[in-house]
């Protein structure tokens, strides 16, 4: 049941806990057949999703899937909050579920999640540091 | 072509802790998009969603059996075993594996032909 | 949770005629991505549920065309345009929507 349809590859409720001050990229999956569909990033202000337009974006490919990566070089306070990704594809916009970024400053490490808090969300752990991306704007 | 079954006792006493496996072919479990899911029907009853293992080890439980639901993936024997303590009489049903395809978010294309697990003394 | 309620809960059919299905949900299933998370199983006796439509309208592979699901929001239908011997059993409607995940209760379709 292989489908051409493009799929973006955030869960619901998808997190992500990092520090101010330190690199972090943002991925977007997406899986596509020939084409690869023009994705774009955009981060929530209530119900609007607001187009980032001058941030640093990549794309990796890998054997099966590709990733449209935001860049946060460095991730600064005001970069919490939730994103989303977005495909258009034959005329078609397809958007991901949203994904949030809870930034902790380190000012203020006492606001960091416990080891509980860790512990029942281990998807809180999951970040990724790749180099060697071809970086454009 | 996708199958999946499902093994485990079927007969446990009270208190006692169920493990279920689900055995499955056709995918593989560390692609992305793929998930399995663990679904219950008491006999003569409605179906209820238990909890879901995702491509990337992420899970999700029904809130109602949280504290009693362990669910874990081993992807090299294309497994996914599914845990429940301390079981009651009336948590006897049929214990389902599905997969979990992906159109945006899951949802289940194919299950397993379920096994029927009796609680009793 | 979101409760997902069917209506007839028993629905004697003649052979060779239309059947319907009604599936209402307490909250709007609409999703924020655009998508409506709402799918129908179908499980004759004796046998493991089976996938008949995914994403409200969408007809899983090897379903039958006689089969069609449509509606939005909180009010969902699935439809036999001609039903057949083989369409006896229990139909449940299910979201993806919202955590967890939940099944409507069952319609039993039988041949009067």
């Known amino acids: 049941k292989e489908s051409c349809d493009v799929q973006l590859y955030i869960k619901r409720q998808s997190e992500h806990s990092i520090l101010a001050g330190d690199p972090f990229e943002l991925e977007c999956p997406v899986k596509y057949c020939a084409n690869r569909p023009h994705v774009t990033w955009c981060k929530l202000n209530g119900t609007t999703c607001v187009k980032l337009e001058d941030r640093q974006t990549s794309w990796k490919e890998e054997k099966n899937i590709s990733f449209f990566i935001l860049h946060f070089e460095p991730v600064l306070p005001n970069d919490n909050g939730s994103y989303r990704c977005s495909a258009n594809f034959q005329s078609n916009l397809i958007e991901s579920h949203s994904t949030t970024l809870y930034v902790t400053d380190v000012k203020s490490a006492s606001e960091r999640p416990s080891k509980d808090e860790m512990a029942s969300r281990p998807w809180l752990l999951y970040r990724h540091h790749h180099h060697h991306h071809h970086h454009h704007h | 072509q996708i199958t999946l079954k499902e093994s485990g006792p079927t007969l446990v006493k009270p208190t006692q802790t169920l493990t279920l496996t689900c055995t499955f072919s056709?995918?593989?479990?560390?692609?992305?998009?793929?998930?399995v899911s663990w679904i219950r029907q008491p006999p003569g009853k409605a179906l209820e969603w238990l909890a879901h293992?995702?491509?990337?080890?992420?899970?999700r439980f029904n809130p109602s059996l949280k504290s009693r639901l362990t669910i874990t993936k081993d992807t090299s024997k294309n497994q996914v075993v599914l845990t429940m303590t301390n079981m009651d009489p009336v948590d006897t049903a049929t214990y389902y594996c599905?997969?979990?395809?992906?159109?945006?978010?899951?949802?289940?294309?194919?299950w397993g032909q379920g096994t029927l697990v009796t609680v009793s003394s | 949770d979101v409760v997902m309620t069917q209506s007839p809960l028993s629905l004697p059919v003649t052979l060779g005629q239309p059947a319907s299905i009604s599936c209402k949900s307490t909250q709007s299933l609409l999703d924020s991505d655009g998508k409506t998370y709402l799918n129908w199983f179908q499980q004759r006796p004796g046998q493991s549920p089976r996938s008949l439509i995914y994403l409200v309208s969408k007809l899983d592979s090897g379903v039958p065309d006689r089969f069609s699901g449509s509606g939005s929001g909180t009010d969902f239908t699935l439809k036999i345009s001609r039903v057949e011997a083989e369409d006896v059993g229990v139909y449940y409607c299910w979201q993806g929507t919202h955590f967890p995940w939940t099944f409507g209760q069952g319609t039993k379709v039988e041949i009067k």
């Open positions: 599905a997969h979990g395809n992906w159109d945006g978010e899951t949802y289940f294309d194919y």
């Open positions: 056709g995918f593989s479990l560390s692609t992305f998009g793929m998930g």
């Open positions: 293992i995702y491509w990337d080890d992420d899970k």
